[in-house]
């Protein structure tokens, strides 16, 4: 025997109390799949969240963050404060990168400057709080057509998010 609820499309629910008829989801709710016995409550983008996509009868609302904040977590479950380049977010707010570290983004953590001497290269440009060191070529690398600079270390995502 086929479940009569399987005929209820997305945007409806199968009413337990009314002989399993398909009824539309009420306002501020949705069902993204067919055959559901309940409608889910629409997400509300309040406070530091703003609406990127309105809720419909078949799909949840999607939020992003107001200016000065960026999304964290699956589906932008949290908004984290932006900092300036050359800073990182700590529990006490945005703090400048310590000497020897940099952050070239508005989010994430300060990362150590590239150590040119480990690669046997001279420093071509000193690092700052907002920019990595630029390493020059190895003396032996100075041949025609060779690149004269080493690209900075690739940016990596932070491994933590401040509370």
């Amino acid at each position: 025997l086929q479940d009569p609820c399987s005929n209820c499309p997305a945007g409806t629910f199968c009413d337990n109390n009314r002989n399993q008829i398909c009824s539309p989801c009420p306002p501020n709710s949705f069902s993204s799949a067919g055959g559901q016995r309940t409608c889910d409550i629409c997400r509300q983008c309040k406070g530091v969240f703003r609406t990127r996509k309105e809720c419909s009868s078949t799909s949840n609302a999607e939020c992003d963050c107001t200016p000065g904040f960026h999304c964290l977590g699956a589906g932008c479950s949290m908004c984290e404060q932006d900092c300036k380049q050359g800073q990182e977010l700590t529990k006490k707010g945005c703090k400048d990168c310590c000497f020897g570290t940099f952050n070239d983004q508005k989010r994430g953590i300060c990362r150590p400057w590239t150590n040119c001497s480990l690669a046997g290269k001279p420093v071509l440009m000193n690092g700052t709080k907002a920019r990595d060191v630029v390493c020059g070529p190895r003396p032996a690398d100075l041949s025609p057509g060779a690149s004269s600079v080493t690209p900075p270390a690739p940016a990596r995502e932070p491994g933590h998010s401040p509370q």
């Epitope: 629910f13 409608c39 889910d40």
Partner: antibody, heavy 122, light 112 residues
Framework: QSVEESGGRLVTPGTPLTLTCTVS????????MTWVRQAPGKGLEYIGI??????TYYASWAKGRFTISKTSSTTLELKITSPTTEDTAIYFC??????????????????WGPGTLVTVSS | AAVLTQTPSPVSAAVGGTVTISCQAS????????LSWFQKKPGQPPKLLIY???SLASGVPSRFKGSGSGTQFTLTISDLESDDAATYYC????????????FGGGTEVVVK
Amino acid sequence: QSVEESGGRLVTPGTPLTLTCTVSGFSLSDYYMTWVRQAPGKGLEYIGIMSGSGSTYYASWAKGRFTISKTSSTTLELKITSPTTEDTAIYFCARDGDYAGWGYATGAFDPWGPGTLVTVSS
Amino acid sequence: AAVLTQTPSPVSAAVGGTVTISCQASQSVVGNSLLSWFQKKPGQPPKLLIYSASSLASGVPSRFKGSGSGTQFTLTISDLESDDAATYYCTGRYNSDTDTFVFGGGTEVVVK
């Protein structure tokens, strides 16, 4: 159709605790389920709900402190992530009957389980 | 978040009398009607009395009557019996994915 909670016990602050709500006579996929608590000498306090499809919604004060999950079609769990002494209470699980046919949680909480006592003390 | 204020507490009446408990919401509940009333006795789980503001739950005597809409709701218990001594709570449903439900603070009914 019935609901029963279990897992309440004495725990020390910071020790995670998981409560279980076992239902019979219906499937969790057919209804919203809610968790409510009552601290000694206090009133009823809404913690959160789970929809038939498994989506969870929490009271603002409970976000991050509690996690509701479904482990089977008849078993619901409430995890108290890091209990404090303020979490000492009787914890109740209840079905939302949605007798008016709205299609989502309406507050028609029935039936209820007898409750399970959680005591947080050092 | 919305707040539900119940008054008065405690309220007392004689057997056979009538008590009226009010529940005032700071914001309108969903559909102006999604408000429930529960009876709570010590050592027992809450019992659903009224749902959707005025609908009587199954097995509940008609002595219990719910009324109201929007932000103002009332539970009236007539022909009071000694077994009605309990604390009564209202709960409202709100259009929010947080604080979807809010309970009132409760009203104790004393039967003399």
